[in-house]
């Protein structure tokens, strides 16, 4: 035989086991809880950091392009891929020709100012997109000089020079004195490139990563 | 939806979820308490056997957190 | 940690505390439905409103599902 | 040493054409730079008006651009400046310049100018 | 167009003096400013070239300095033979504008 408990002993046990019970599932709900509003507001504070980190990286370019064109990058509402308002966009870079006459070295310092280089062309399809944007009586800067004159052709951004990848207008580069590079029209060709004098003032073509924010 | 927004969705329902079983398995428990207290009092200790029985199935129960 | 794989290593910490508690109260249920019926048998029928008032209090929590 | 000559009448009457020549000496016009007309205004006042390239392109300062022409004849190391339509307001010293030395950062080689009045 | 706007107009200093002759642009020219100097009768002669570099020949008495929008021509020790127009002018980008000119005499 089990010895008998006492009626209020067994109810001060069912007290205790209830208040253990609920302690225990009032624990289990603040737990919850607690991952709930992590799950909530940590990601609220994620996106306002990463708003503010916009916001900041959005000020570094507003001095010279006070407005940006952004594009929605894939599916994800968080990738957006922007360029400056006057400039036009192609694949990962965005491009803005400059109708100020400039020198060269002038050219390349107010591509610079602007966060940008003066163009450096990889492919017949950024030229043909470039092109559509270019005055045809008129000649433009590209990033490509040969400082030493000795035909040692080189990119602003430290591109390799591929011969492969060039677009001269047929007999050109033709004079070691001339030591940048310009696109140009000529009707017998068409759009292609040509060697100048560094110093004869020139339009000219920036171009610049795509600001990801 | 947006994938995140999916993912909200998904984080409140879980957490409802929880809370609900929560509370119902806490319920249940008490309840099951209750029976044997109640159980106990009517056998009078003749059937003490199945007292006993039913409390250790209960004890052994009682051990048994919910996980954290 | 990026947004979105917080959501997902929460969603993956609710769901698995659901899992865990469904388990729990499930086994629960099973075991005081067991206790009922080896109650039941013990008494031989002698007692039976003991036996009679456990069911109810089962019967009333078995048509409690946990939502889905 | 390159030296620039301007050469032209000195008298124009209004809406009547001012032509004008540079004369170099010392430098090819077609081996580099850029070949300038630049003109004084009897307050001091200065002002670019265009320029021809070794190249051959133009450019025409845009206050300028319809009235405006810069031509050159190689064989000659000759380039030269029409101006349209002229009134009171376009009598002025005219320099020609050499443009581009220094990487472009001032202007070296001037002529020594020519007054041309626009009177009636 | 960038304008160009030289202080002041007119100046009156004696021989051994200094003086300060300035240009302020309308946008930043990067130091791409040429001084000029300018006697009565001939054409001007070009002192100092992005805004610092002194011009070959050219005295040293002669400084050039600025940046951005603001630039300045000092000259040491007045000699007589500095009398004359002075002139800026910006080289950033075509149009190249010159400064309305300041004319220095002898007090």
């Known amino acids: 035989m089990v010895p008998e408990e006492e009626p209020q002993d067994r109810e001060k046990g069912l007290w205790w086991f209830q208040l253990k019970v609920w302690s225990m599932a009032v624990v289990s709900i603040l737990l919850l809880s607690v991952c709930f509003t992590v799950s909530s507001v940590v990601p609220h504070n994620f996106m306002y950091s990463k708003t503010v980190k916009r916001l900041s990286k959005l000020r570094e370019y507003q001095q010279y392009h006070p407005s940006l064109t952004c594009v929605m990058e894939g599916k994800d509402i968080e990738d957006w891929s922007c360029c400056p308002t006057p400039w036009t966009s192609f694949q990962s870079s965005c491009y803005f020709i400059s109708t100020g006459m400039q020198s060269w070295t002038k050219s390349q310092k107010n591509c610079s100012v602007m966060g940008a280089d003066l163009v450096v062309i990889n492919t017949r399809e950024e030229q043909d997109f470039i092109i559509q944007n270019l005055k045809r009586n008129s000649s433009y800067f590209l990033g490509l000089s040969d400082p030493g004159g000795r035909r040692h052709w080189q990119w602003v951004d430290q591109t390799p020079y591929n011969e492969n990848v060039t677009f001269w207008h047929s007999g050109e580069p033709n004079n070691l004195d001339e030591r940048c590079a310009i696109i140009n029209f000529r009707s017998s060709e068409e759009w292609g490139w040509n060697d100048i004098h560094c110093h004869v003032p020139q339009k000219s073509i920036c171009k610049m990563k795509k600001i990801y924010i | 939806l947006g994938e995140p927004q999916l993912c909200y969705i998904l984080d409140a329902i879980l957490f409802l979820y929880g809370i609900v079983l929560t509370l119902l398995y806490c319920r249940l428990k008490i309840q099951v308490r209750k029976a044997a207290i109640t159980s106990y009092e009517k056998s009078d200790g003749v059937y003490t056997g199945l007292s006993t029985r039913n409390q250790e199935t209960y004890e052994t129960l009682k051990h048994e957190k919910p996980p954290q | 940690l990026g947004e979105p794989q917080l959501c997902y290593i929460l969603d993956a910490i609710l769901f698995l505390y659901g899992i865990v508690l469904t388990l729990l109260y499930c086994r629960l249920k099973i075991q005081v439905r067991k206790a009922a019926i080896t109650s039941y048998e013990k008494s031989d029928g002698v007692y039976t409103g003991l036996s009679t008032r456990n069911q109810e209090t089962y019967e009333t929590l078995k048509h409690e599902k946990p939502p889905q | 040493d390159v030296q620039l000559q301007e050469s032209g009448p000195g008298l124009v009457k209004p809406s009547q054409s001012l032509s004008l020549t540079c004369s170099v000496t010392?430098?090819?016009?077609?081996?580099?730079?850029?070949w300038n007309w630049i003109r004084q205004f009897p307050g001091n006042k200065l002002e670019c008006m265009g320029y021809?390239?070794?190249?051959?392109?133009?450019y025409y300062n845009p206050s300028l651009k319809n009235r405006i022409s810069i031509t050159r004849d190689t064989s000659k190391n000759q380039f030269f400046l029409s101006l349209n339509s002229v009134t009171t307001e376009d009598t002025a010293t005219y320099f020609c310049?050499?443009?581009?030395?220094?990487?472009?950062?001032?202007?070296?080689?001037w002529g020594q100018g020519t007054l041309v009045t626009v009177s009636a | 167009d960038i304008q160009m706007t030289q202080s002041p107009a007119s100046l009156s200093a004696s021989v051994g003096e200094t003086v300060t002759i300035t240009c302020r642009a309308s946008?930043?020219?990067?130091?791409?400013l040429a001084w000029y100097q300018q006697k009565q009768g001939k054409s001007p002669q070009l002192l100092v070239y992005?805004?610092?570099t002194l011009a070959d020949g050219v005295p040293s008495r002669f400084s050039g300095s600025g940046s951005e929008t603001q630039y300045s021509l000092k000259i040491n020790s007045l000699q007589p033979e500095d009398f004359g127009n002075y002139f800026c002018?910006?080289?950033?980008?075509?149009?190249?504008?010159f400064g309305g000119g300041t004319k220095l005499e002898i007090k």
């Open positions: 021809i390239s070794y190249d051959g392109s133009n």
């Open positions: 002018q910006h080289f950033w980008i075509i149009p190249y504008t």
């Open positions: 946008g930043n020219i990067h130091n791409y």
């Open positions: 010392g430098y090819s016009i077609t081996s580099g730079y850029y």
């Open positions: 992005n805004a610092k």
């Open positions: 310049v050499r443009g581009g030395d220094y990487d472009d950062g001032g202007f070296a080689y």
